[in-house]
């Protein structure tokens, strides 16, 4: 069973609406965990949710709280709560097979579509996450390059499926 | 009676919702009409609606059209239609007291709050606009000096001649 999966609610519809309701060229800052694009999720997920929480909290400050309907504020507020729950859950499960990257996350700018693809992928990682004893796979080999591993893209920071 | 006032609908509530639903630090490009900062609004309002139309059309392209409720796309689409009506109306009334600057408008960046304040007040200017033959207010002439008017001195004047 996935760690913290009970904390994850189905927010796909809200995220789709939010992405549509943000300017396509608006850039969201996220401290991106190195290796997220090539390593298994247990290597980066604990750190990624912390960074997502920070980014979403910052993003929330950029909007006004209007009571009417599903506003960007209300959607982001909901997402912040989901991620904050996951951050707590990660702390509770820190002894389990959740690794901390030895490289510091680097601030990068992402479009809303890119940012919420990372968000969705991180959420999905919790749904599917299963404790495993294998730990050696959290090292990015120095020999791993775009020529040797087709999963790494030089032009894009990650290769993720489109937002559902 | 205001020129084109019948083309103006009450969109204040929609604009308020839109501003709240845009990131506070998102910058919207508007070609700023030279003299707008120092000349009365009847000197530049006709040109401003053309620029607002362009900016809003560009802004519309930054959003996805989602059918659900009052999305940013649907609000901006409505505002584009209002402004495009005013642009047509300006053309119809171009022989009236609406001035055109010979200087090209310069692109400037505005926050959503600033941009839509300009939008709202441009709309209001049409509601209140009254035809008048007086055009001298639209020219800051180099002949205006302490000799002609002891209260003011002008250096590096704008030259915005009225258009017949």
């Amino acid at each position: 069973e996935g760690i913290c999966r009970n904390r994850v609610t189905n927010n796909v519809k809200d995220v789709t609406k939010l992405v549509a309701n943000l300017p396509k060229d608006y850039m969201i800052t996220l401290k991106y965990v190195p290796g997220m694009d090539v390593l298994p999720s247990h290597c980066w997920i604990s750190e990624m949710v912390v960074q997502l929480s920070d980014s979403l909290t910052d993003l929330l400050d950029k909007f006004s709280n209007i009571s009417e309907g599903l506003s960007n504020y209300s959607i982001i507020d909901k997402l912040v709560n989901i991620v904050d729950d996951l951050v707590e859950c990660v702390k509770e499960n820190s002894s389990k097979d959740l690794k901390k990257s030895f490289k510091s996350p680097e601030p990068r700018l992402f479009t809303p579509e890119e940012f919420f693809r990372i968000f969705n992928r991180s959420i999905d990682a919790f749904k599917d996450f299963v404790v495993a004893s294998e730990t050696s796979d959290c090292v990015v080999s120095s020999t791993l390059s775009p020529e040797k591993d087709s999963r790494v893209s030089v032009t894009k920071p990650f290769m993720l499926p489109p937002v559902a | 009676e205001g020129i084109c006032r019948n083309r103006v609908t009450n969109n204040v509530k929609d604009v308020t919702k839109l501003v709240a639903n845009l990131p506070k630090d998102y910058m919207i490009t508007l070609k700023y009409v030279p003299g707008m900062d120092v000349l009365p609004s009847h000197c530049w309002i006709s040109e401003m609606v053309v620029q607002l139309s362009d900016s809003l059309t560009d802004l519309l392209d930054k959003f996805s059209n989602i059918s659900e409720g009052l999305s940013n796309y649907s609000i901006i689409d409505k505002l584009v239609n209002i402004v495009d009506d005013l642009v047509e109306c300006v053309k119809e009334n171009s022989s009236k007291d609406l001035k055109k600057s010979f200087k090209s408008p310069e692109p400037r960046l505005f926050t959503p709050e600033e941009f839509f304040r300009i939008f709202n007040r441009s709309i209001d200017a049409f509601k209140d606009f009254v035809v008048a033959s007086e055009t001298s207010d639209c020219v800051v002439s180099s002949t205006l000096s302490p000799e002609k008017d002891s209260r003011v001195s002008v250096t590096k004047p704008f030259m915005l001649p009225p258009v017949a």
Epitope: - | Y32, D37, L109, T111, E114, R121, D137, V140, R151, V152
Partner: antibody, heavy 115, light 105 residues
Framework: LVESGGGLVQPGGSLRLSCAAS????????MSWVRQAPGKGLEWVSA????????YYADSVKGRFTISRDNSKNTLYLQMNSLRAEDTAVYYC???????????WGQGTLVTVSS | QMTQSPSSLSASVGDRVTITCRAS??????LGWYQQKPGKAPKLLIY???SLQSGVPSRFSGSGSGTDFTLTISSLQPEDFATYYC?????????FGQGTKVEIK
Amino acid sequence: LVESGGGLVQPGGSLRLSCAASGFTFSSYAMSWVRQAPGKGLEWVSAISGSGGSTYYADSVKGRFTISRDNSKNTLYLQMNSLRAEDTAVYYCARRDFFAHFDVWGQGTLVTVSS
Amino acid sequence: QMTQSPSSLSASVGDRVTITCRASQGIRGYLGWYQQKPGKAPKLLIYSASSLQSGVPSRFSGSGSGTDFTLTISSLQPEDFATYYCAEYIRMPYTFGQGTKVEIK
């Protein structure tokens, strides 16, 4: 808008006022200095266009005062030379909105010209 | 030149107060009304002769065009005791009226 630089100066002396702006696109707005002598009304002193390319002065200060701005620092200035007793006033910087005249004002800075 | 009247007036809370301003030449609707309290900066109340500035209570209203303008406070409140100025902004030099002081009766 926050003014600074006021103080006591002797007749014939100089003073430079500054006005730090925040919270709006400074370079897009014309800015003005307006003064108010003790117990008197408001008097417009000078204005400058958003780009800084055009400047305007009341005749009472022409040739003595210079208005300028540094858009990179979001700051408006008023250089006051050859000061006179009648220049004693609270000096306010104010933003001229495109439609609404002076819609944002600073708190003012007192300039006292006295020997 | 802007001529404001009266120069001062005494009124009670709840009173309807009217201040007038006359321009020496036509200024269309390019007139603003400001409120100033002792030791404070002026505050814009009305612009374009009749448009209420954002955040200003609706008891304040303005009217007029051309040369004659009016500021009305429909029901005077304790915080409204202050000095009021009109100002034109169609052309520089911008000129202010001499002010109307609204005092407690």
